[in-house]
Interface confidence: low
Amino acid sequence: DTHKSEVAHRFKDLGEEHFKGLVLVAFSQYLQQCPFEEHVKLVNEVTEFAKTCVADESAENCDKSLHTLFGDKLCTVATLRETYGEMADCCAKQEPERNECFLQHKDDNPNLPPLVRPEVDVMCTAFHDNEATFLKKYLYEVARRHPYFYAPELLFFAARYKAAFAECCQAADKAACLLPKLDELRDEGKASSAKQRLKCASLQKFGDRAFKAWAVARLSQKFPKAEFAEVSKLVTDLTKVHTECCHGDLLECADDRADLAKYMCENQDSISSKLKECCDKPLLEKSHCLAEVENDEMPADLPSLAADYVESKDVCKNYAEAKDVFLGMFLYEYARRHPDYSVMLLLRLAKAYEATLEKCCAAADPHECYAKVFDEFQPLVEEPQNLVKQNCELFEQLGEYKFQNALLVRYTKKVPQVSTPTLVEVSRNLGKVGAKCCKLPEAKRMPCAEDYLSVVLNRLCVLHEKTPVSEKVTKCCTESLVNRRPCFSALELDEAYVPKAFNAETFTFHADMCTLSEKEKQVKKQTALVELVKHKPKATKEQLKGVMDNFAAFVEKCCKADDKEACFAEEGPKFVAASQAALA
């Protein structure tokens, strides 16, 4: 399916609006520090060029690849060297090395100010004054902070963002209408970004075989009535879509995602009974809906797996003939029977099954050797089951904030070398698993919890890769994608860690503490808690609880005082001294 002009092909397929949006996202994800106006200028130039190619595909440069066209455009930015330093060296390379170079310089933690939400009236005025610019600004600000955000999905978020303003800026109480919608979009957006980051890490660090295995397991859970061949086709197409998006090929990715949605809706009967309501929606909404669709009901009377995968005398023959296909079928059959298992657990079971066949098919009596393979799965299944049970009990006992604190202490003791902001961010997110998953029925708890934890721990891995400080983190992050969570769970107190020297400045607080939002206050207290554990890694739960209770009382007292700053100045050193004594 070759086209004379790739840029004309994508422009025609996607339409001008989506084309411009995706090019803006692509540029913003590559050059994360560039001002908005610079990106808009580049996008307009690319769009005008694309239109000339639509009019005449033989026009000059229209036959160039998208990487060449986009890379050439990015390399025209005058301030590339002073803004991005060595990233400017990418421009000396030829494609495809130049694009690979740009990809390697994507920054998961860019030094950008947090987005401040203006007053509602200010936002509504900006929306009405220039809706197009307002929405482009949204795409730009999100894309530069989340350089792996799933681009076609970001267009869906932008459409919802637009709809929220269109509705709420006309409402009687604009703020009451708009703010909850913006909060929801922000939270969903962060979750979507983190989920996509794991997909990209899976593809980039562990290869497409790892991603395909994940996709087989997940799609088999979602579509248990679909045949293996159907699931395999969806997996192949989905892998192509995500490989493209993770590789910066956003136009191809969006185009292929639309094709996949079309295929799924045209073949609902052989995929899932749950697709119908998605397929009536417009494109962006349809693709989102299909991605989030609930699991279909499992077929009745599925025969036992043991017959084909344990009892059959042909197991080794079938395995030898087509290893990946046989293992893929095993994973498909196991996953469709177990919507109650996490994808990561299913992948561990497939890995264990593969290891058993590798060993047993070379043995004197292979059948005798692998006859008990399913029994070996039991401890693998029980480990996440117990973990979820224990942590949900702890969450129900403590509530979210204190549960986060328990995790902060737990993870700081495991990997105290990791930076405090990273430990706070990751532990707070790990702690959100309670509210997200523990309220669910038993059959949904493990897939919710463990697969969410995999996403959060990937964030730790991605941040740690940028500034590696702990061999233990590197080991857990790089050895096995499916065993990351068990690897982190198994880490104990780091005995080799030299405690951090006490720094009174870290525990000095001011009156500005009182004007912070509840979330910001929590982050301040949790930052102090991490620093305490880094100073005294062997402190007991009771000691730490005592210090934190004193801290909360001290802050509350000073925030109620008439002269708040004087109170902090006077009570602060007392709190520090008392804390040191309590932890001595």
Partner: nanobody, 115 residues
Framework: EVQLVESGGGLVQPGGSLRLSCAAS????????MSWVRQAPGKGPEWVSA????????RYAESVKGRFTISRDNAKKTLYLQMNSLKPEDTAVYYC????????GSQGTQVTVSS
């Protein structure tokens, strides 16, 4: 592209026989277990029989045991279902699937058992 094309269905009297065939293409037929599934009017799909990739292991639903025989010819990439002693309750669209799925991935072939 994976394709499964069934044939051999038709109208038969109770007690009669039919042999269904399923021609496969677009995938490594010899590496996959296969099944026959049927769907009677107004009912959900019902798994009928399965065979492993080599053809050594076969399994049947209780309702067809002793009457139906599943087999395969990997060289011809074809799956078969020999149906003897047919009953009116065997009336359905029969289709073949990869693995042990009960999803319709093909058009199927109509079997009607009636006097």
């Amino acid at each position: 592209e994976v394709q499964l094309v069934e044939s051999g269905g038709g109208l038969v009297q109770p007690g009669g026989s039919l042999r269904l065939s399923c021609a496969a293409s677009g995938f490594t037929f010899g590496s996959f277990g296969m099944s026959w599934v049927r769907q009677a009017p107004g009912k959900g799909p019902e798994w009928v029989s399965a065979i492993d990739s080599g053809g050594a292991d076969t399994r049947y639903a209780e309702s067809v045991k002793g009457r139906f025989t599943i087999s395969r010819d990997n060289a011809k990439k074809t799956l078969y279902l020999q149906m003897n002693s047919l009953k009116p309750e065997d009336t359905a669209v029969y289709y073949c699937t990869i693995g042990q799925s009960t999803s319709r991935g093909s058009q199927g072939t109509q079997v009607t058992v009636s006097s």
